[in-house]
Structure formats: structure tokens, C-alpha cells
Amino acid sequence: EVEKTACPSGKKAREIDESLIFYKKWELEACVDAALLATQMDRVNAIPFTYEQLDVLKHKLDELYPQGYPESVIQHLGYLFLKMSPEDIRKWNVTSLETLKALLEVNKGHEMSPQVATLIDRFVKGRGQLDKDTLDTLTAFYPGYLCSLSPEELSSVPPSSIWAVRPQDLDTCDPRQLDVLYPKARLAFQNMNGSEYFVKIQSFLGGAPTEDLKALSQQNVSMDLATFMKLRTDAVLPLTVAEVQKLLGPHVEGLKAEERHRPVRDWILRQRQDDLDTLGLGLQGGIPNGYLVLDLSMQEALS
């Protein structure tokens, strides 16, 4: 903390301008009025203060606003935002998307910091849901943002926001997250025609149930192997050989290269070897001819 000393004669700041960058830390403390600083925050960001100097300015703002900064100040923090702790940010009430964008811009190109994570959390909680504009903004700055949310948090994403999601935004999502996002995507894209619908829904299919995969197999979609490998194993297992063939179209040949990996491996184990042979891919491990398959889970349900 800077020792409080009287401001030297003629050095009292009447406005926030470039001359202040040459003030020593104690002079900034003594000669810059906190209220002046708050009203001219837009100028602060235009002056390349050192972080040591920004510490002094932050201290002044903290004294002026012990309960948290107003949005008029927050919007113009610039590099000063990097000096904020998550505890500081928890005191804020950020409602403007412009404010959010301005602060994310400061951190652009870097991994999401605890400060940014706290800011986003405050913003989204304040809005009550992840609306399309917010999601658009967040995924533009952090493509992996969506997959950093818990399934519970994702449940607040309205289906209309799904239009903002790009395939790369879902790269790191796990099946639990896709389970929540898939029904929303299905609802969002429901009025699209077959081929257009598949292009949009494809990235979300890791959350699709068996019946939807069966329906897709009737639409000549030609799913690629990368998408197939991300499907839920429990959703793939009940599909017949004919359905998988229709689902993959010309990509069905790729099954051979993936026969030892889930979900292909588990699916093969559930198919009759006869049926697998019809593919002509040399897939092995199916149920030998003449064997009877008992579905024990069904039997338990009946008893």
C-alpha cells in the first residue's frame, strides 16, 4: 500500500490524462481524486499505466466503492480488470453485454482465468439464463465455454440459443453434457428439412437416443465415422446391422478400422455373425449362428 503524503504543489489532477503516467505511485495516491477517476475511467484505459500504477488506481476505486464497482466503472476497466480478484468481481452486478464484451476483450487469446470465469458466472446468473446473444459472445471468445458448464447449468440454456453453437464449441463436451444439449438442439432445428437438419444436429448426436438414430438411418444421412464413434454406446447397441449400414452409408467401411473401439466393439458383440458378414468387411466377434440371445434385462423387468 502506498504511504499517504500530501500532493506536491501544482500536481493535483484536474482530469485523467497522459501526464499521470509519469507520476510516482505516491503522487498518484495523493494527487488523483477517486471520484474523478471513477467518472473518467474511459480515459484510464487509453493510458498505458504500469501494473504498479494500476494497483494504486484500483486501491482508490476500492476505497470509493467498498460494496463493489458500478457498471459505469466496470465497463471501462480495461487492463485494470486483470488486477481484479474473483472476490472483487463477486461484488459486481454486470447486466450489459457490452460490458461483458469489453472485459473479455482484455483477456482475449488467453485461457479463461478465474476472474473471467467469475465474471461470466455473475453475468449469466444475473440474466437468469444463457440467452443466444450471451452464448454467441462467450463461445466467440472461448470456444470450449459450453463444455465447461455442468449439466445443471446447461439446463438453463434455451433451445433458441442452440443456433449460436458451432461444432467446435462441443469438442470437449462429455456424454452427460450432450444428453442435456441434444433435446434442446432437436427442438431448435425441428423445422429444418432432412439434410439441413442433419448438418445442424450432427455435433449434438452424442446425446441422441436409439429411436432418433433409427429415424436418422431412414434418411440417407451418411454419418461419418467420427460422429458415429461419439454416439452413446447404449444408444448404438440396439441398432441392427441394416440400420447401421443405412446410417453410415458409404462410411460403413470405416467400421473395420474401429472394430476394437467403443461403441463399435460392443455393438459387434450384440450382432449375429451372419448379419455382420453381409457387410463384407470381415468384422468378427458377433453371436455365432444357432445361438439364442436372451435379453436378461427384459426378463428382470417382467418378473
Epitope: 498505458p48 504500469t50 501494473y51
Partner: nanobody, 117 residues
Framework: QVQLVESGGGLVQAGGSLRLSCVAS????????MYWHRQAPGNERELVAY???????NVADSVKGRFTISRDNAKNTAYLQMNSLKPEDTAVYYC???????????WGQGTQVTVSS
Amino acid sequence: QVQLVESGGGLVQAGGSLRLSCVASGRTSTIDTMYWHRQAPGNERELVAYVTSRGTSNVADSVKGRFTISRDNAKNTAYLQMNSLKPEDTAVYYCSVRTTSYPVDFWGQGTQVTVSS
């Protein structure tokens, strides 16, 4: 992080010139502004000049018209050209940088400038 090495200091007569260099290494892509400071014996450190990544620069009133700061982004180097040197310019000159990724100033070890009368 960013590492800084200053050079170019030395002993010079009043009225003479020196050119200081500050070479940055490490995560140089995150450097925003480069600064020259100085600290004379028994005095506080003071900012002498700065130059931003966009080329905006300024120098303190005490050295205006005598010192100029420049920067070569390709070489990650800042220069301080010091002309018409005075004995009161004697100090250790330090380079520092502000980065966009980490909210602390990174500093060099300093280079001694001595101006004799």
C-alpha cells in the same frame, strides 16, 4: 513469463550520447508496452519513457527534447536514445514491460549510466 536484458550503459561526459537497448525474450507476443525507468542513488525510481505495441510513445518532461524512445517489434527490443546528457541523468536505467496475460510488470536487472562533468 518475459525476461529482459538491458545494455548500452557506461561512463560518458556531459553533453555526450548513449543508446540503451532492452531485449525481451520468453512470451514476447503478450508484450503490450515497454518502459524505461531510472533510479539515481538515494532517489525514488522514476519513469523516463514508454512505447506501446502500436508505436505510441512519450518521454518525461525532465528529458523532453533530449531522450527519445523507439521499439523494434520484430526484434522484441526497445531503445532509449539519450543525447545532451547531464550529470543529473546519472542513474541505473531499468527496462520493464506490461503484458496482456499476467498483471505484473516484468523488470530487467538495469544498466548503469554515469555522466561526468
